[in-house]
């Protein structure tokens, strides 16, 4: 049993990060076997933290391969029956000791998760899990607390409405105080610590114990058959059946005698006292969230999980917040639906990640009658009189640019501006000079032009202005219609997409 850098992972790391002494704690969490996201749901079957943790102090050049681990067992009490299939989560926490602002610092070094099958009362199961550069070797087993017995820790207590109602000779049942303890069904004298029964008058032994009442440790039990124990660690003195007779090791394990007992050297993929426990295979479905299990078609080979988008971890048990990677461009809103990622795009952008900058003014709203103008790979708003700013939302002073020529006075008006011209000038912007003899009116610039008939000239100017205005209005109408069509198209698509999102979120 160890926790340290895995093989071939470079220079062994210290868990203390060269910051003085630290301690390792292990948090064990058990969840029902069907738990979807093993790190996100509650430890419904129970949880426990290791105690009696030795302090680890890093010394220069010292290998971190063998770290001092917590002494003894981590016991995880569980309620009710033992499910047999469960999710085992083991977290390795580091407590940095010494002077730190705010007291000791805690860090999660590693978390391993796996789906397991295990009958209560069985032998220790061994396992090795790797996460990142760390490797954890551990063993686990499930044991029933009396009066629960059997592979599923079935209760042997009879239901009663209250402890006070328990019949003669019966006590309240533990750990189920609302029930009464049933009369003993095991063989009289059967060890309550090392034996259990599933049928009346039987005494089955837990791993490591033997004898009719499960009171004899396995280390001396092989001498019961016409042998007597010899001095310490010399085995048995009289001939008789040996502990390896009949090969108690299953699945091709090889047996060797040790201290009057036996030890099985198990082939890869098997473990347990008699190599009776096999490893998890892909057929067991160890990968959460639909992950693809690769390898592990037999217990000799370790499995690897290939996770769907949005999940990670050795068993695809951790959900990734994919929106934290900000996949939606151009200010799009990110929605992680679990099985899919959706981007709700701002006006003017489209595509699964809002990556397409719409190639016209369809998504660009220019306020207050402004028109959208393209050019040079960008778009801008050409604002109506009296408005300015990027989207024509700001009120502008039409007189700020001094539009009235030749000293004309500017007056702001709700529909634009009016120029009061100085004597000798006329026109919308006072741009025409009036001859003193009243013969003709000439545009102030260019000065070379002269008109014989001022009336005809003015009519021509007005006609030109009218044509230009009509052209501008027609252009605006065309732009508005095309923009409305495009907006309707994208709104329709967006409404459909939002409906999809709503359905998917509800699902």
């Amino acid at each position: 049993h160890s926790f340290g850098p895995g093989p071939g992972l470079g220079t062994p790391r210290s868990p203390c990060n060269a910051r003085g002494p630290c301690r390792l704690f292990f948090r064990v969490c058990l969840k029902p076997g069907v738990s979807q996201e093993a790190t996100e749901s509650l430890c419904a079957l129970g949880a426990a933290l290791s105690t009696s943790v030795p302090v680890y102090t890093e010394h220069p050049g010292e290998s971190a391969a063998a770290l001092p681990l917590p002494d003894g067992l981590v016991r995880v009490p569980f309620r009710d029956a033992w499910p047999g299939t469960f999710s085992l989560v083991i977290e390795t926490w580091r407590e940095q000791l010494g002077e730190h602002a705010g007291g000791p610092a805690w860090n999660l070094l590693a978390r391993v998760v796996g789906r397991r099958r295990l009958a209560a009362g069985g032998p220790w199961a061994r396992d090795v899990q790797r996460t990142g550069t760390w490797e954890l070797h551990f063993s686990y087993r499930a044991r029933c607390e009396p009066p629960a017995v059997g592979a599923a820790c079935a209760r042997l207590c009879r239901s009663r409405s209250a402890p006070s109602r328990c019949g003669p000779g019966l006590r309240p049942c533990t750990p189920f105080p609302d029930e009464c303890e049933a009369p003993s069904v095991c063989r009289p004298g059967c060890s309550p610590e090392h034996g259990y029964c599933e049928e009346p008058d039987e005494c089955r032994c837990l791993e490591g114990w033997t004898g009719p009442l499960c009171t004899v440790p396995v280390s001396t039990s092989s001498c019961l058959n016409s042998r007597v124990p010899g001095p310490a660690s010399t085995g048995c003195l009289l001939p008789g059946p040996g502990p390896c007779d009949g090969n108690p090791c299953a699945n091709g394990g090889s047996c060797s005698e040790t201290s009057g007992s036996f030890e099985c050297a198990c082939p890869r993929g098997f473990y347990g006292l008699r190599c009776e426990v096999s490893g998890v295979t892909c057929a067991d479905g160890p990968c959460f969230n639909g992950g693809l299990c690769v390898g592990g078609e037999d217990p000799d080979s370790a499995y690897v999980c290939h996770c769907p988008p949005g999940f990670q971890g050795s068993n695809c048990e951790k959900r990734v917040d994919r929106c934290s990677l900000q996949p939606c461009q151009n200010g799009g809103l990110c929605l992680d639906l679990g099985h899919a990622l959706r981007c709700r795009c701002r006006a003017g952008f489209a595509g699964p990640r809002c990556e397409h900058d719409l190639d016209d003014c369809a998504g660009r709203a220019c306020a207050n009658g402004g028109t959208c103008v393209e050019g040079g790979g960008s778009r801008r708003c050409s604002c109506a009189l009296g408005f300015g700013g990027r989207d024509c939302r700001e009120r502008a002073d039409p007189c700020a640019s001094r539009p009235c020529a030749h000293g004309g006075r500017c007056y702001a008006h709700f529909s634009g501006l009016v120029c009061a011209c100085a004597p000798g000038y006329m026109g919308v912007r006072c741009e025409f000079a009036v001859r003193p003899d009243g013969a003709d009116a000439v545009p102030a610039a260019p000065r070379g032009l002269r008109q014989a008939d001022p009336q005809r000239f003015l009519a021509g100017v007005i006609a030109v202005i009218v044509v230009v205005v009509i052209a501008i209005v027609a252009g605006i109408v065309v732009l508005v219609i095309s923009r409305k069509k495009r907006m309707a198209k994208y709104e329709k698509a967006e409404i459909k997409e939002m409906g999809e999102m709503h359905r998917e979120l509800n699902a």
Partner: antibody, heavy 117, light 107 residues
Framework: EVQLVESGGGLVKPGGSLRLSCVAS????????MNWVRQAPGKGLEWVGQ??????????HYAESVKGRFTISREDSKNTVYLQMNSLKTEDTAVYYC????????WGQGTTVTVSS | NIVLTQSPATLSLSPGERATLSCKAS??????VSWFQQKPGQSPRLLIY???NRYTGIPARFSGSGSGTDFTLTISSLEPEDFAVYYC?????????FGGGTKVEIK
């Protein structure tokens, strides 16, 4: 050995109903997402729908083309997933496969559904 | 839905030759592309996952490459049992979608 065996296919008139079954063996069925994928004659593969685990409240997802007409359910105690097909159309004619997981790793041999008048 | 376009539709080759099949996605799918093989009268079989990883039990002559929108399945030296229809599938965005298939036939 992992095996998925589909059944329940046959000839049905447009507007009719059919229920397909897929029985799994060799896997811990309750730990696997299950999908239905179909293949029209001479055509490519089309995902039909998916059912997830008990821990996901048996969440289901469907292709747009079958939404509201097809229903997927599962019975973990029987290692079986079902596809209930209602209001069948001629374009639903295909071989229907059940597959596992998100990546369709294990496949059944398929069952043929023919919708014709 | 993401559209996958496979080319060519048919590939006529002799045993021992190298086969190169193409799959183009309508948008970025990262490396979430799988390749499936389907022989006449049989169900599809997963060959490659994650664009370039061989699935359990798949011979080394099959290899996949690509990321983003362009993906390739290569069969380095065609064996008689490799003549079949090959489909690419994307698993980046739900729902999963498949290409139209490429038929590898004996010349």
């Amino acid at each position: 050995e992992v095996q998925l065996v589909e059944s329940g296919g046959g000839l049905v008139k447009p507007g009719g109903s059919l229920r397909l079954s897929c029985v799994a063996s060799g896997i811990t069925f309750s730990n696997f997402w299950m999908n239905w994928v179909r293949q029209a004659p001479g055509k490519g593969l089309e995902w039909v729908g998916q059912i997830r685990l008990k821990s996901d409240d048996y969440a289901t997802h469907y292709a747009e083309s079958v939404k509201g007409r097809f229903t997927i359910s599962r019975e973990d105690s029987k290692n079986t997933v079902y596809l209930q097909m209602n209001s069948l159309k001629t374009e639903d004619t295909a071989v229907y496969y059940c597959t596992t997981g998100y990546y369709f790793d294990y496949w059944g041999q398929g069952t043929t559904v023919t919708v014709s008048s | 839905n993401i559209v996958l376009t496979q080319s060519p539709a048919t590939l006529s080759l002799s045993p021992g030759e190298r086969a190169t099949l193409s799959c183009k996605a309508s948008e970025n799918v990262g490396t979430y592309v799988s390749w499936f093989q389907q022989k006449p009268g049989q169900s599809p079989r997963l060959l490659i996952y994650g664009a370039s990883n061989r699935y359990t039990g798949i011979p080394a002559r099959f290899s996949g490459s690509g990321s983003g929108t362009d993906f390739t399945l290569t069969i380095s030296s065609l064996e008689p049992e490799d003549f079949a229809v090959y489909y690419c599938g994307q698993f980046y965005s739900f729902p999963s979608t498949f290409g139209g298939g490429t038929k590898v036939e004996i010349k």
